[in-house]
């Protein structure tokens, strides 16, 4: 039975050219996290494997940095980065947990940044 829940940064906004941290946190389960996949509209951004470490997709290598923790940092944001991002936690023995974050990249310098949520 899957008892865990995923907390995410929720809906966030950031300025064009800036950077943002995408963060998820799995709680209320003792399941072992074996791998976390970060995806944007079915495009793989990165994988963090518990044993083998990080893999960043080559097409995002210049603009995506691993961490903090199991999170992902997006840099040099463009308006095309606006959209849904998913953290997919693969766990044993529970299975898969998915969190959703919506990022809006604004042209204006008055973009309000969502709270930067850190893993405790």
């Amino acid at each position: 039975m899957m008892t865990g829940t995923i907390e995410t940064t929720g809906n966030i906004s950031a300025e064009k050219g800036g950077s943002i941290i995408l963060q998820c946190h799995l709680s209320s389960t003792t399941a072992q996290v074996t791998q976390v996949n970060w995806e944007q509209q079915d495009q793989l951004l990165a994988i963090c494997n518990a044993d083998l470490g990080w893999h960043i997709s080559p097409s995002f290598k210049d603009r995506v940095a691993p961490g903090p923790g199991l999170g992902l940092t997006l840099q040099s944001l463009t308006v095309n980065d606006t959209g849904e991002y998913f953290c997919i936690y693969h766990t044993y023995p529970d299975g898969t947990y998915t969190g959703r974050i919506f990022l809006e990249v604004l042209e204006s310098s008055v973009a309000e940044h969502g709270a930067r949520f850190q893993i405790p």
């Epitope: 074996t34 791998q35 996949n37 079915d42 793989l44 994988i47 494997n49 044993d51 083998l52 470490g53 893999h55 693969h90 898969t96």
Partner: antibody, heavy 123, light 107 residues
């Protein structure tokens, strides 16, 4: 050309351990992760785990955790798979297989395979 | 882990005919799927990666399609050397997992 040459067939008693070797040639050994797959007689393919020959980092399938150990010797371009506490169900052909992509574990289908090593567990 | 299910288990086809093999994933693997061919007493041989891209040296009669959870391997005109067992494999989540295989036999 890429070649993966495995050690010869083994016959082991239940409870014993077996260590299978896989010698790589024809490419830069430390640039490609190596996976291990087994196949019981008349059965399908079963993923066991993977090793990064550069760093020695490993990832094992949950089923084999605690019983399998994958190591490498960069001086001889050889990877090893040791399976302990053998039981009759471990009777299978064991294959090493190279992950296609250079320098990572993704996207990594298995492009070159060893010839296989038959391990028989019998009392 | 992701469960890969292949169907049918056995496919009886006459030489020159088309063979269609199916593979289903228990959750989306996007296009992270490979196909392998195995003949008796031999190691598997890599045919397809990325669900639809043929590996080097693989004849054009082999084609792969699909994305997400449903995949197909098609052999357009079976040659005698194509009678073998075919396996699909996902490589997006560890442990990587294989389907149970489809045996293509001569009708």
């Amino acid at each position: 050309q890429v070649q993966l040459v495995q050690s010869g067939a083994e016959v082991k008693k239940p409870g014993a351990s077996v260590k299978v070797s896989c010698k790589a040639s024809g490419y830069t050994f430390t640039s490609h992760y190596m996976g291990w797959v087994r196949q019981a007689p008349g059965q399908g393919l079963e993923w066991m785990g993977v090793i990064n020959p550069s760093m020695g980092a490993t990832s094992y399938a949950q089923k084999f955790q605690g019983r399998v150990t994958m190591t490498r010797d960069t001086s001889t371009s050889t990877v090893y798979m040791e399976l302990s506490s053998l039981r009759s169900e471990d009777t299978a052909v064991y294959y090493c297989a190279r992950l296609h992509v250079s320098g990572s574990y993704y996207p990594a289908y298995l492009d070159y395979w060893g010839q296989g090593t038959m391990v028989t567990v019998s009392s | 882990e992701i469960v890969m299910t292949q169907s049918p288990a056995t496919l009886s086809v006459s030489p020159g005919e088309r063979a269609t093999l199916s593979c289903r994933a228990s959750q989306s693997v996007s296009s992270n799927l490979a196909w392998y061919q195995q003949k008796p007493g031999q190691a598997p041989r890599h045919l397809i990666y990325g669900a639809s891209t043929r590996a080097t040296g693989i004849p054009a009669r082999f084609s792969g399609s699909g994305s997400g959870t449903e995949f197909t391997l098609t052999i357009s005109s079976l040659q005698s050397e194509d009678f073998a067992v075919y396996y699909c494999q996902q490589y997006i989540v560890f442990p990587w997992t294989f389907g149970g295989g489809t045996k293509v036999e001569i009708k």
